[in-house]
């Protein structure tokens, strides 16, 4: 807390300019009018204030706006944003995408801080859903943003927003998140033709059920091995050798190199050895010829 002291004669700030960098903390407190600061916030960024001086400026704004800053001030906070606590940010009502962009720019190149996370949360909640423009903005600054949301939060993403998602935005998503996103992507891209549809849906396929994979296998898609290995194991296991062969096309040859990794390993164990032999890869570990395969899960369902 800076002591309340009178402003020395002739030092009263008429505008926010470079001369203020020579003011001591107490002089800033005494000589800078909070209302003036609020109207000239855009100038603060251009002036090389010390961290201590910025603390004083923040304190002045806090006194002026105890219920939270107005958006006109928030938009021009610049580096002063880094001084804000999540508690400060929870008092704000940010509705403009331009304000959000301006503040994200300040934190650009750094990990998502608690301040940024709170800001995004306030912004999205204020909008009611994660629309395309917001998603575009957030993933541009934080490619991993989408995968940081819970499946519940992702359920508020409208299918139309899926168009903004790039493959790299889904890199860190787990199967539960893709389970939520995949049906939305399927809906969003439903009017595209075969090859274009596959290009768009490919990144979301970690949430695809078996029947969709079977359908894709009929479309000459040539899925690459990295995509195949991100599929749900339970969705891959029921696929036949012929279906996997059609799904992967020329990339099926890479199964040999990945035979020890899931879901390839588990899938191999479920196939007949003579079917595996048709792949021409020397894959071993399938069900020997002449063995009878009982589907116990089916039996349990019937009893």
């Amino acid at each position: 807390e800076v002591e309340k002291t009178a402003c020395p004669s002739g030092k009263k700030a008429r505008e926010i300019d470079e001369s203020l960098i020579f003011y001591k903390k107490w002089e800033l407190e005494a000589c800078v009018d909070a209302a003036l600061l609020a109207t000239q916030m855009d100038r603060v960024n251009a002036i090389p204030f010390t961290y201590e001086q910025l603390d004083v400026l923040k304190h002045k704004l806090d006194e002026l706006y105890p219920q939270g800053y107005p958006e006109s001030v928030i938009q021009h906070l610049g580096y002063l944003f880094l001084k804000m606590s999540p508690e400060d940010i929870r008092k704000w009502n940010v509705t403009s995408l331009e304000t959000l962009k301006a503040l994200l720019e300040v934190n650009k190149g750094h990990e998502m801080s608690p301040q940024v996370a709170t800001l995004i949360d306030r912004f999205v909640k204020g909008r009611g859903q994660l629309d395309k423009d917001t998603l575009d903005t957030l993933t541009a600054f934080y490619p991993g943003y989408l995968c940081s949301l819970s499946p519940e939060e992702l359920s508020s993403v409208p299918p139309s927003s899926i168009w903004a998602v790039r493959p790299q935005d889904l890199d860190t998503c787990d199967p539960r998140q893709l389970d939520v996103l995949y049906p939305k992507a399927r809906l969003a891209f439903q009017n595209m033709n075969g090859s274009e549809y596959f290009v768009k849906i490919q990144s979301f396929l970690g949430g695809a059920p078996t029947e969709d994979l079977k359908a894709l296998s009929q479309q000459n898609v040539s899925m690459d091995l990295a995509t195949f290995m991100k599929l749900r194991t339970d969705a891959v296991l029921p696929l036949t050798v012929a279906e996997v062969q059609k799904l992967l096309g020329p990339h099926v040859e890479g199964l040999k190199a990945e035979e020890r990794h899931r879901p390839v390993r588990d899938w191999i164990l479920r196939q007949r050895q003579d079917d595996l032999d048709t792949l021409g890869l020397g894959l071993q570990g399938g069900i020997p010829n002449g063995y009878l395969v009982l589907d116990l899960s089916m039996q349990e369902a019937l009893s």
């Epitope: 690459d224 990295a226 890479g254 040999k256 990945e258 899931r262 048709t278 792949l279 021409g280 890869l281």
Partner: antibody, heavy 115, light 113 residues
Framework: QVQLQQPGTELVTPGASVKLSCKAS????????MHWVKQRPGQGLEWIGN????????FYNEKFKNKATLTVDKSSSTAYMQLSSLTSEDSAVYYC????????WGQGTTLTVSS | DIVMTQSPSSLAVSVGQKVTMSCKSS????????????LAWYQQKPGQSPKLLVY???TKDSGVPDRFIGSGSGTDFTLTINSVQAEDLADYFC?????????FGGGTKLEIK
């Protein structure tokens, strides 16, 4: 030891077709796919396509789809590539190579298209 | 198609020197599930066919001398030859087998001073 034997040279006239061979030995022929690669003098390498010797499935680089046809004869452990409607642009060394990693290569066949 | 770019296109070094060549791909070659990069390096000596040196970006093929070291991940890869020998005179190609059509870099020609 693994060997992929290819004839050294082929001389053909423009407009004709040629069938290049690659005889494999020293491993189970049906356990590795066979790839074909083109190399023009002083230039880089281009992947033409591959074939599954077990069932004859083929996949081609779009660029060579109307130029190359890949086949195999399991009984002689030999892979073939037929090139059609030959022009001087097809003059190159053609290699067969084993498997996804291309871990063994034939010595290459030098194809010369000239009238 | 994935574009593979190699640099330099040629370099000349003395026997015993260390040499480094680069290969960049236009998209990531990493399979994040298995943590394998689908990139291989080949050596082609004058008048011979290519020979596999390194696969999965850093795994040496059997019989390849220890002086050959592959490294890198994603889109940037390097082949290093520690203490170059006269028999290393050759063209070196990188190749992606992440997706078809499988594509090769333009090559780096290694000459011995």
């Amino acid at each position: 030891q693994v060997q992929l034997q290819q004839p050294g040279t082929e001389l053909v006239t423009p407009g004709a077709s040629v069938k290049l061979s690659c005889k494999a030995s020293g491993y189970s022929f049906t356990s590795y796919w066979m790839h074909w690669v083109k190399q023009r003098p002083g230039q880089g390498l281009e992947w033409i396509g591959n074939i599954n010797p077990s069932n004859g499935d083929t996949f081609y680089n779009e660029k060579f789809k109307n130029k190359a046809t890949l086949t195999v004869d399991k009984s002689s452990s030999t892979a073939y590539m037929q090139l059609s409607s030959l022009t001087s642009e097809d003059s190159a060394v053609y290699y067969c190579a084993r498997g996804w990693l291309r871990d063994y290569w034939g010595q290459g066949t030098t194809l010369t298209v000239s009238s | 198609d994935i574009v593979m770019t190699q640099s330099p296109s040629s370099l000349a070094v003395s026997v015993g020197q260390k040499v480094t060549m680069s290969c960049k791909s236009s998209q990531s070659l990493l399979n994040s599930s298995s943590q394998k990069n689908y990139l291989a390096w080949y050596q082609q000596k004058p008048g011979q066919s290519p020979k596999l040196l390194v696969y999965f970006a850093s795994t040496k093929d059997s019989g390849v001398p220890d002086r050959f070291i592959g490294s890198g991940s994603g889109t940037d890869f390097t082949l290093t030859i520690n203490s170059v020998q006269a028999e290393d005179l050759a063209d070196y190609f990188c190749q992606q087998h992440y997706t078809t059509p499988y594509t090769f870099g333009g090559g780096t020609k290694l000459e011995i001073k």
